[in-house]
Structures are given as C-alpha cells and as structure tokens.
Interface confidence: low
C-alpha cells in the first residue's frame, strides 16, 4: 500500500524549518537489525529553485528545509518520494518501500498591493454625496481573498476637510472613491488626492512598500446651477404702522452662489397675506402698495410675514425663498371702545353697579390707562348717571338718582386712551333698567323688551 503524507510550510521559511515527520511500520522486531529502519528522499518535484529544498533525518523521518527560496507565488506544492529501508538502510540486504510526502507552501504577506496606474481620474457634480467618483485598481500576488490580498485604502493627502472616503469592493479588491460631504465648486474646483493601499495584515518581515503602493486621484468638480439665497433670512425690519402706500421699505436681495455662471436674478412675491407690498423684479426693492396696519388679523405678535422668491435664469432655473418680517411699531390709530355694549341694572341703584372695561386694539403706550367720562349733553346723562374710574382699564357706571323707571337707556360714554396725541371715542352703552328682586336680579324681563328707548332720561 503506497502511503501519502501531507504537510505544510510557510513560504520564505529559513533553512532548518521543521516541515513534517514520516514514519514506516516494520513487523520485525525494531530492536533487531531487520527491524531497524532508515529514511531517505529519493526525489523532489519540481526541482526549482533547487533540487534539494528539503532533507530528512534518516532515523526519525523528520523533514526540514535545507535551502532558502520557498515562494508560494512560484511553487505552491512539492512532492517528495521517501524510501524507508530496514537492516539500518543496507542497500544490499535491506528491504525497502516508498511513500509520497506532499508539502504545500502556505502564503505569507510578502507581496504588497500595487496600483495599476500612477494617477486615476474622476469627476463629481458639486453638492452631491454618496456617489462613486473613481475606481482604483491594484494587483497583489498573494493568495486572493485572504487578509494578505485584501486591500485597505486610505487617503493620505489632499482632503483636509474629509470630503472623500474609499471603500474596498470585496469581490474585485478595487477601491471605490466616494464623496461623503458635499463639495462646493465655487470653493474647490479640483481635488488631487494622495491614496495608499495596504493589506489587512502587515507585510512579512523585511518586505517594504514600493512606490506603486501609493497613487494620486485627480477629481474634477462639475459646476451645477444652485439656488439663489436671501441673506439674512428672515430679514427683520422695524417700521411704524400707518405708512402711506408707495413708501420704500427696504431692499431684499438674494445672492447666487454660482460665481462662474453669468446669470440674472428676478424677484417675485410668493406670499403677502394682506397684499401690502410689491417687489421690484430687478433690484429687489420692496414698496408698500397699501397702508400697513399692526391691528390687521394678518399681523401676528406685531410681526407681518411676507415671502419672496428669487429665481435665476440658469439651466435648469433654480430659485430660493426669503421671508421679510416687518415688526410693526404701534401708532395710536385706534380709538378705544367700551365693553360690554349692553348691561343691566336695577331701578334703585343700591347695590348695583355696571362694570365696564376698555377695549383698544392698540398696545401700550397707545392703549391704557384710559379716561372714562360722560358727555355734557344731553344734560340728563350727567344728572342720572355717574362714572367712576376704578383703574386704568376699568370703570363703574352707577345710577346717580335714587330711582329710574324700568326701560332701555342709551348711555354715551367718552373713553380716551393714553396715546400721544390721545384718541377718544363715544361708545353707546345700552342699559336695561329693570325691577329687581331682593337678590338684585331682574324680575320683569318681558316688560323691558317692550319698553321704549331713552337717552338716560
């Protein structure tokens, strides 16, 4: 029976490196002469780089290397024919047999990855990310799909802001250069990256990285039409309300990032809820077309928001929006009013008072404190009624006389705000005077409805 023995040895091993042991079995007494075996290598295939790459210890069967030059990339396997002879190896009297020793040369990382070109080229549109810019290719003579072959790429220069990254394609071992942060053409029109390739494991001792382990990648940035932008955005201006139509408020212009494209920007109005404004399409000048009113329902917290569009004439055309916030300073353009507009009191004044409050759509200091008064005419008003200011916002209306017949009376109240100059208004308070129970509640509602109007008489 012909035996096959398998062993391994790393490439580049020094002479004297143990490889494997072969042993033969002899049924004779091992202590007798005819049982004492001796081993020798009969042949080695292939015979490169030397026909005697290995030796065998003739007594133990240990195979070791005796020559340098094991190189997996040249010879991946050696086949040795081993002869065992008894009678201590005496060729005349001894009996012999042969076996095969198959020695596989295993890979070590003795070959660095080398770029297939000194310079690679790629291009990227500005502002785009996650796209492949260039494909880097390397060669590596080590065993494919092992850590000694797998390439790891890094950018060693030319990318101070970290805009690029390189991933390895696990199948092809190529380096895929991708953009990970957007690039602005107006800032960087080209990048020249220095890239290096290494393996996943360090190179074997004594092996150096050659110049071919580095390369350059020349990336051209392509100019793309970008949105014009308003700055500042929002733009805040303070302006008194009540401005006449035709007043120039401000200029709200946009910048176009595309410095290398000859473009014009045109302005249009996107949103102007009260239709108070117009914008010059060429120079962005904003002019009023109506009176600005802080008290308008379109003004929230004193701020009026209008939105404008800046459009360029690039291909394709791009646009950006900007918000103008007009902080409207109050003027005293609203006269105060009295609330409620209707009230009830009893025929006899005790203990009834009508609490009234002021409503002014303006704000401090054009609102309260308010002054409350009764007119001099008709004389019955001041004769029958009295008004007492409780504080800046509240007053009380009371009957001055001890009795007033049930009915509905219109009491004019003069109310004046604290604006400079102040604004006054005469508010009519409809007072239902009625007969009341001991709790001060009206008992004759039906009769009041039919009663005629009086003016405090």
């Amino acid at each position: 029976l012909h035996q096959v023995w398998n062993g391994t040895v790393p490439e580049g091993s020094k002479p004297g490196t143990y490889v494997m042991t072969v042993t033969a079995i002899d049924a004779d007494d091992p202590n007798a002469l005819n049982g004492m075996l001796r081993y020798r290598i009969v042949s080695q295939a292939p015979s490169t780089p030397s026909p005697n790459m290995f030796t065998i210890n003739n007594e133990t069967g240990d195979i070791i290397t005796v020559a340098a030059g094991l190189d997996r990339e040249k010879v991946q396997q050696y086949t040795l024919i081993i002869q065992a002879t008894d009678m201590e190896g005496n060729p005349t009297y001894g009996l012999s047999n042969t076996a095969t020793a198959v020695i596989t040369v295993t890979d070590v990382n003795d070959n660095p990855p080398e770029f297939t070109a000194m310079t690679f080229y790629g291009e990227v549109p500005e502002n785009r990310v996650d796209i492949i810019v260039a494909n880097l290719t390397v060669t590596d003579k080590d065993q494919p799909h092992t850590p000694a072959w797998n390439a790891v790429y890094r950018i060693s220069g030319g990318d101070p802001t970290g805009r690029f990254a390189i991933q390895t394609d696990p199948n092809s071992n190529d380096g895929l250069v991708t953009v990970v942060k957007p690039i602005d053409f107006e800032t960087n029109r080209m990048f020249v990256l220095t890239v290096a390739a290494e393996n996943q494991v360090p190179l074997a001792k004594g092996i150096q990285h050659p110049p071919q382990s580095t390369a350059t990648v020349s990336v051209t940035v392509i100019d793309v039409n970008e949105n014009p932008y308003f700055a500042p955005n929002p733009k805040i201006i303070r302006q008194e309300e009540g401005l006449h139509a035709g007043t120039m408020l401000t200029t709200f212009t946009a910048q176009d990032p595309d410095r290398y494209m000859q473009q014009n920007i045109r302005y249009t109005k996107l949103s102007d809820p009260a239709n108070w404004l117009k914008i010059d399409p060429v120079n962005g000048q904003i002019t009023t077309i109506a009176v600005l009113d802080r008290e308008s329902p379109n003004v929230k917290n004193n701020i009026y928001n209008a939105t404008f569009l800046a459009s360029d004439n690039g291909i394709p055309p791009m646009s950006g929006t900007g918000t103008l916030q007009i902080y409207l300073l109050d003027i005293n353009d609203n006269a105060p009013q009295v609330l409620p507009q209707e009230a009830e009191t009893c025929e006899t004044p005790d203990p009834n008072s009508i609490n009234i409050t002021a409503l002014d759509y303006d704000i401090d200091p054009n609102a309260g404190p308010f002054a409350f008064d009764l007119p001099l005419s008709p004389v019955t008003i001041k004769r029958n009624w009295t008004i007492t200011r409780l504080n800046g916002d509240f007053a009380q209306l009371n009957l001055k006389i001890k009795f007033l017949e049930a009915g509905i009376y219109e009491v004019p109240i003069i109310i004046t705000d604290s604006g400079n100059p102040p604004k006054s208004n005469i508010s009519i308070l409809r007072v239902k005077v009625c007969q009341c129970d001991s709790n001060g509640d009206c008992t004759d509602v039906d009769r009041i409805v039919g009663a005629g109007l009086g003016t405090g008489a």
């Epitope: 303070r238 917290n301 004193n302 701020i303 902080y327 300073l329 409050t357 704000i363 401090d364 200091p365 504080n391 800046g392 916002d393 604290s418 604006g419 400079n420």
Partner: antibody
Framework: QVQLVQSGAEVKKPGASVKLSCKAS????????IQWVRQAPGQGLEWIGW????????KYNEKFKDRATLTADKSINTVYMELSRLRSDDTAVYFC????????????WGQGTLVTVSS | DIVLTQSPATLSLSPGERATLSCTAS???????LHWYQQKPGSAPRLWIF???NLASGIPDRFSGGSGSTDYTLTISRLEPEDFAVYYC????????FGGGTKVEIK
C-alpha cells in the same frame, strides 16, 4: 448686548424717600417700556408700574400710585423710580425690566437694588 | 385685577423625576400674555417660557408649557440639578400680575 444696570443698595428710615435708577444700553431706549417690580424677602414678585420713554406715558399699580413716581432722563438712557413715605414693609429688592416686543413678557432684567427700611 | 394662583407652593422631587407646575387665572387670560420666569436665590428672575408655550432663548427642551381655558402648566420632563429653583407665572392681559411662585426643591 442688552443691559439694565441698577443703582446700589440703600438704607432708609421710615417716612423717608428713595430714588432708584436703571440705566439701559444695547437697545433703542425709546422703543421699549421699562417696568419696575419688587420682591420682599422670601416673597413673590409685585409689579409697581411702567414708564414708556417714547412718549413719557406712565402706568402704576393702584397700590403704589400715591407713593411711586417714575421719571426718565432720555439723554442718559436712564429711568428712575422714587418711592416716598417709606414703611418697613417696603424693604425689598427692586428690579427694573424691559418689556419684550410683544406679549408683555419681561425679556431683560436689571440685577436688582436692595432697599432696607429700618429705624 | 386678574389673580394668578400657583400650585403647589413647594414641589419636592428627585433629579430625573417629572415636574408639573400649575397656574390658575381668576378669569380668562389670552395665551399670548401668559409667561413663566425662573428665579434662583440672589438673582433676578429670568424669562423661561413666553406666550404659554414658547421656550425663551437657551432654555432646554425638557421644559414645556401648555394651557386650558384658565389653567396653565409648566412641565419639566426629567429634572436636572440646575432646574431646582422658584418658577413664577405672569400675565399682562388685564393690568399686570404675578403668581405667588412654586419652589421646586430636591427631595
């Protein structure tokens, strides 16, 4: 930046008057109401009144309208609050504060002035 | 004048817990005019929440404000050590008043 800097601590006897100042900087003085608020030791906040430098309008808390006087010197962006006929329960930290653009909140405050009324 | 009543007067909680402070108005107050301030010992009050629910500049988003018709709340989702202070509500709708304050203290 917006700042309201108040005058230093005062010690007064009952019946006396005290005049506190609040100097504004970092904003247009005539565009904002300046409020005065006080805080007695361990107590809450109590509004005294406001002064509007734009028109000279003044509004007082009814409780203080007979004893508090608010004035201003627009040339030095300063508002004053004088409190007369001092009582021991007027011992408090007095703050000035700026009313914000809308909603009536106080967005910037002075550091406060301690007034101690003691015989 | 509108009276603002804050409850509880004192809230004893541990860091990491949720705090809910209440402010009840004696009559209706527009949400635009109800505000909250934080005050720490020896310092002026600082605007914390304005117009019921808007956080002032630099206030962390663990704070929030809300309202019913006359009830207003300030909520702190997870108390941090720096949140222990007195909080005041304030209205400027009719005249001008402050609540009595709620002291949030470490349990």
């Amino acid at each position: 930046q917006v700042q309201l800097v108040q005058s230093g601590a005062e010690v007064k006897k009952p019946g006396a008057s005290v005049k506190l100042s609040c100097k504004a900087s970092g904003f247009t003085f005539t565009d904002y109401l300046i409020q005065w608020v006080r805080q007695a030791p361990g107590q809450g906040l109590e509004w005294i009144g406001w002064f509007y430098p734009g028109s000279g309008s003044i509004k007082y808390n009814e409780k203080f309208k007979d004893r508090a006087t608010l004035t201003a010197d627009k040339s030095i962006n300063t508002v004053y609050m004088e409190l007369s006929r001092l009582r021991s329960d007027d011992t408090a930290v007095y703050f000035c504060a700026r009313r914000g653009d809308w909603g009536g909140f106080f967005d910037y405050w002075g550091q406060g002035t301690l007034v101690t009324v003691s015989s | 004048d509108i009276v603002l009543t804050q409850s509880p007067a004192t809230l004893s909680l541990s860091p990491g817990e949720r705090a809910t402070l209440s402010c009840t108005a004696s009559s209706s107050v527009s949400s635009s005019y109800l505000h909250w301030y934080q005050q720490k010992p020896g310092s002026a009050p600082r605007l914390w929440i304005f117009s019921t629910s808007n956080l002032a500049s630099g206030i962390p988003d663990r704070f929030s404000g809300g309202s019913g018709s006359t009830d207003y709340t300030l909520t702190i989702s997870r108390l941090e050590p720096e949140d222990f202070a007195v909080y005041y509500c304030h209205q400027y709708h009719r005249s001008l008043t402050f609540g009595g304050g709620t002291k949030v203290e470490i349990k």
